[in-house]
């Protein structure tokens, strides 16, 4: 015997209190698939969250973060404070990267500079809190008689990560 609730389309729910008729989801609730016995409450984008996509009877609202914050977690479940380049977020707030580390984004942690010598290369441009070092040719390439080396292009300004 077919379940009468299977006929209830997205945007409705099978109302057991009313002889299993397909009742429309009440305002501020939704059902994204057919055959649902309840409608889910719409997500509310409040505080540091802002609405990226409004809720409808068939789909939940989607949130992102207000300026100065960025999304973390599946479906932007959290908003984390942005820091400046050259900083990382700690429990006490934004802190400058320690010497020998850098962060070229507004989020994430400070990472150690590249160790050029591990690749047998020399440091062409020193690192900063905001930029990694630029490794140059190996010392052997700089010996007399070696072909001239075109200096590398300046480090590219990083784009913002997708929010």
């Amino acid at each position: 015997l077919q379940d009468p609730c299977s006929n209830c389309p997205a945007g409705t729910f099978c109302d057991n209190n009313r002889n299993q008729i397909c009742s429309p989801c009440p305002p501020n609730s939704f059902s994204s698939a057919g055959g649902q016995r309840t409608c889910d409450i719409c997500r509310q984008c409040k505080g540091v969250f802002r609405t990226r996509k409004e809720c409808s009877s068939t789909s939940n609202a989607e949130c992102d973060c207000t300026p100065g914050f960025h999304c973390l977690g599946a479906g932007c479940s959290m908003c984390e404070q942005d820091c400046k380049q050259g900083q990382e977020l700690t429990k006490k707030g934004c802190k400058d990267c320690c010497f020998g580390t850098f962060n070229d984004q507004k989020r994430g942690i400070c990472r150690p500079w590249t160790n050029c010598s591990l690749d047998g290369k020399s440091v062409l441009v020193n690192g900063t809190k905001e930029r990694d070092v630029v490794c140059g040719p190996s010392p052997a390439d700089l010996s007399p008689g070696a072909s001239s080396v075109t200096p590398p292009a300046p480090a590219r300004e990083p784009g913002h990560s997708p929010q």
């Epitope: 997205a10 945007g11 409705t12 429309p24 989801c25 305002p27 068939t58």
Partner: antibody, heavy 122, light 109 residues
């Protein structure tokens, strides 16, 4: 422009049939927008006839008194809803309104047509 | 569901506070809409979900109530407010969307 336009009203004899149309423009019926029919006899109250699910399913919600005489249907390709009225009586004389019942407005009728007059008389 | 409105008519003056009530025959939570209708015109949505003002509706209109008892209030009646007001259950289902029979607001005197 977002609007509903009814057509098909007119004079019909008792026992006759009539099909009213309601064409939507500027938006599409969907799971968020249900087309409905409401009527108003001269000098009388508004009377709810029924609504139909706005998406691709044919679920209808009807007033009990309409059973067997009035049927609501929809053609999504034309973005049009219909009211088929059979076995018409003098007391069915009324202005028939098409309305949009919107999830965003608590399923209230947030958009109405201008109405079409149906007169049942011999 | 039956909707009972009262009074069926009332007379008032510009500036008056006007209150119209609507009673549902069974609980409809907050699923109630209020409309204004002028002669020869289609109804206009004023309030939905019992208390939410529809877009473009002046703030002198307000709605309250839940369950079976609801109220529409016009805080200071304006000349353009003389009309008939209807409540409607939006508790979908067969016979779930009934209207009240209206309250006609006319000019006193």
């Amino acid at each position: 422009e977002v609007q509903l336009v009814e057509s098909g009203g007119g004079l019909v004899q008792p026992g006759g049939s009539l099909r009213l149309s309601c064409a939507a423009s500027g938006f599409s019926f969907s799971a968020n927008y249900y087309p409905c029919w409401v009527r108003q006899a001269p000098g009388k109250c508004l009377e709810w006839i029924g609504c139909i699910y706005g998406g691709s399913s044919d679920i209808t919600y009807d007033a009990q008194w309409t059973k067997g005489r009035f049927t609501i249907s929809r053609d999504n390709s034309k973005n049009t809803v219909y009211l088929q009225m059979n076995s018409l009586r003098a007391e069915d004389t009324a202005v028939y309104y098409c309305a949009r019942s919107a999830w965003y407005s608590g399923w209230g009728g947030d958009l109405w047509g201008q109405g079409t007059l149906v007169t049942v008389s011999s | 569901i039956q909707m009972t409105q009262s009074p069926s008519s009332l007379s008032a003056s510009v500036g008056d506070r006007v209150t119209i009530t609507c009673q549902a025959s069974q609980s409809i939570s907050n699923r109630l809409a209020w409309y204004q209708q002028k002669p020869g015109k289609a109804p206009k949505l004023l309030i939905y979900s019992a208390s939410t003002l529809a877009s473009g509706v002046p703030s002198r209109f307000s709605g309250s109530g839940s369950g079976t008892d609801f109220t529409l209030t016009i805080s200071s009646l304006q000349p353009e407010d003389f009309a008939t007001y209807y409540c409607q259950s939006t508790y979908y289902g067969n016979d779930g969307n009934a209207f009240g029979c209206g309250t006609k607001v006319t000019v006193l005197g």
